[in-house]
Amino acid sequence: WELTILHTNDVHSRLEQTSEDSSKCVNASRCMGGVARLFTKVQQIRRAEPNVLLLDAGDQYQGTIWFTVYKGAEVAHFMNALRYDAMALGNHEFDNGVEGLIEPLLKEAKFPILSANIKAKGPLASQISGLYLPYKVLPVGDEVVGIVGYTSKETPFLSNPGTNLVFEDEITALQPEVDKLKTLNVNKIIALGHSGFETDKLIAQKVRGVDVVVGGHSNTFLYTGNPPSKEVPAGKYPFIVTSDDGRKVPVVQAYAFGKYLGYLKIEFDERGNVISSHGNPILLNSSIPEDPSIKADINKWRIKLDNYSTQELGKTIVYLDGSSQSCRFRECNMGNLICDAMINNNLRHADEMFWNHVSMCILNGGGIRSPIDERNNGTITWENLAAVLPFGGTFDLVQLKGSTLKKAFEHSVHRYGQSTGEFLQVGGIHVVYDLSRKPGDRVVKLDVLCTKCRVPSYDPLKMDEIYKVILPNFLANGGDGFQMIKDELLRHDSGDQDINVVSTYISKMKVIYPAVEGRIK
């Protein structure tokens, strides 16, 4: 019996087609992805093959203005239109709190939404009961397939799930649910979830009875043969993990942003043994036409976005200096504003010992592309912010050793004075450079804001200590020559859309007046 698994993950609000790098589509003939194109391919496969499941491994939420405006209603609407069979909850599904998940998505989705390792407690337990499930048994042709969901246990540090959801260890939570499916005589089981490739592999290795793992969160690109676009494969598709008891378990993921449709064919015998598995992600490029009815629907929903772009988010009473002449040479108040917004967006998980889990931000000056003039009645719009941050990136959370941070700050000024983009803007950091010294030895003082303290204060950076830092995904991926960050980071979790972070902060503050205050000397 053959099953075709179609899968997406980390789509992050890319409802419309995008450019090859998943930013805004400029030249339509070169654009990729989008739900209209995805629907064409899915329907083509559904017509050609008998047993097809369309699955999503989480993080549909967050990433473009679509989510900012529609807050998840767009996810439910278009996933329903594409007739997804199941979805696992990702960490970003909690970005607008539990209410922001329940109302727009859980109550509106016509497909099961799954997570076995999220347990509701207190008043939320009855409110959310039945709206998401640990597993679902789906009829496929003459057979049944069990889908069991999971979500990153780091979600409380990455999003806003509140205090009434407990995120358990994935493996501990999955095993009893898989055992339950086994007692129900379900012998074909897919683990669908959002914890990253390393955890996906661990689930394949440790959770007895799981036949296939369909994952997300780490934006992992797997491919067998010559890859069709710019993404470099992290391994073969499917990636085969040998479980502790000797089962050969295919693990798949389909990069991100709806650029690819994962396509996996699994052959089962009558006992549910996986006899063979093969496939590859399908690049959703312009050779696949956009479905006209879905495209028309997208265009209808688009109208509200254009209106939103010009609405006032808040006001500034000072000039927001985002000029390259400032931000690539010295501390600029636009850099301070953005870093403050980045930290504010990550205010969560305080306890008796920590006022927050993260206090530091770094931001390449070259990523700030425009100033905002306060003389336009002080008005700040989404459109203004899109000019400042035009690349459609995310502000991510990483863990780095102090020694890596020191290298990053040396790199920041290694060729100072040439208007290059690597000059770092900061938050929660005081750095002093001596530019008379030779490159690689110019950082003379580096103090960082404590987190394990009731009154935040600046302490000298410790080389062997591990620090959490918020930074653009561009830097986490080694952009602007920050290879040391990419090579030495100990953990990397993707965060929220850059413009969305700043716009939320401005809306919250209502009136802003960031200053140059001696963070960089």
């Epitope: 055992d179 086994k182 012998n187 009875g209 085969i240 040998t242 502790d244 008891d245 000797g246 089962r247 050969k248 052959e267 015998d269 006992r271 549910g272 043994n273 996986v274 006899i275 063979s276």
Partner: antibody, heavy 119, light 107 residues
Framework: QVQFQQSGAELARPGASVKLSCKAS????????IQWVKQRPGQGLEWIGA????????RYTQKFKGRATLTADTSSSTAYMQLSSLASEDSAVYYC????????????WGAGTTVTVSS | DIQMTQTTSSLSASLGDRVTISCRAS??????LNWYQQKPDGTVKLLIH???RLHSGVPSRFSGSGSGTDYSLTISNLEQEDIATYFC?????????FGGGTKLEIK
């Protein structure tokens, strides 16, 4: 239907080696583990080890590590077990069987090969 | 390694009898218990997997039960062709291990 054809009886001297074969038919050879089981006369069954022909992954019980070598030839759908440094206690019937990994049961068995170790 | 113990090494019963053969594991094996029949000619067949699931083609007079460490195989209406030795095997943890066997004879 699924079947295993095992090689004929072997007579070997102590210290010698034997190589037993098990030819599979009626199923996808590369999709299942082949298990090897020993039974001494009048005794119970003892698991030796297993091979997954799809990638030549092997597992052995501690007692047979280093002395049993499992191999598989996918072109002929045949699994082999070589047993070296034979002693009288290796005189037994050796079975190959197909392993189901949902419950790790052995659902189809060969008829067995008798090995006699004698000087 | 998990030890599998079949305390009764041989059992006599009459045709038509209900016969129960037991098997004990040295630790919890989470229902991953399989039963085999070995005929006097050496032929081995799977009867039951995962404690109670009848393998295809096996007569319905065979049934299995148990949990944790204690398991049993029942033949509800003994027939002549059931004369054989019965082995249990755990599929919970490598290495897979078998019980010593229970030989069933006719009274």
């Amino acid at each position: 239907q699924v079947q295993f054809q095992q090689s004929g009886a072997e007579l070997a001297r102590p210290g010698a080696s034997v190589k037993l074969s098990c030819k599979a038919s009626g199923y996808t050879f590369t999709g299942y583990w082949i298990q090897w089981v020993k039974q001494r006369p009048g005794q119970g069954l003892e698991w030796i080890g297993a091979i997954y022909p799809g990638d030549d992954d092997t597992r052995y019980t501690q007692k047979f590590k280093g002395r049993a070598t499992l191999t598989a030839d996918t072109s002929s759908s045949t699994a082999y077990m070589q047993l070296s440094s034979l002693a009288s206690e290796d005189s037994a019937v050796y079975y190959c069987a197909r392993g189901n990994w949902d419950d790790w049961d052995f659902d189809v068995w060969g008829a067995g090969t008798t090995v006699t170790v004698s000087s | 390694d998990i030890q599998m113990t079949q305390t009764t090494s041989s059992l006599s019963a009459s045709l038509g009898d209900r016969v129960t053969i037991s098997c004990r594991a040295s630790q919890d094996i989470s229902n991953y218990l399989n039963w085999y029949q070995q005929k006097p000619d050496g032929t081995v067949k799977l009867l039951i997997h995962y404690t109670s699931r009848l393998h295809s083609g096996v007569p319905s007079r065979f049934s299995g039960s148990g949990s944790g460490t204690d398991y049993s195989l029942t033949i509800s209406n003994l027939e002549q062709e059931d004369i054989a030795t019965y082995f249990c095997q755990q599929g919970d943890t490598l290495p897979w291990t078998f019980g010593g066997g229970t030989k069933l004879e006719i009274k």
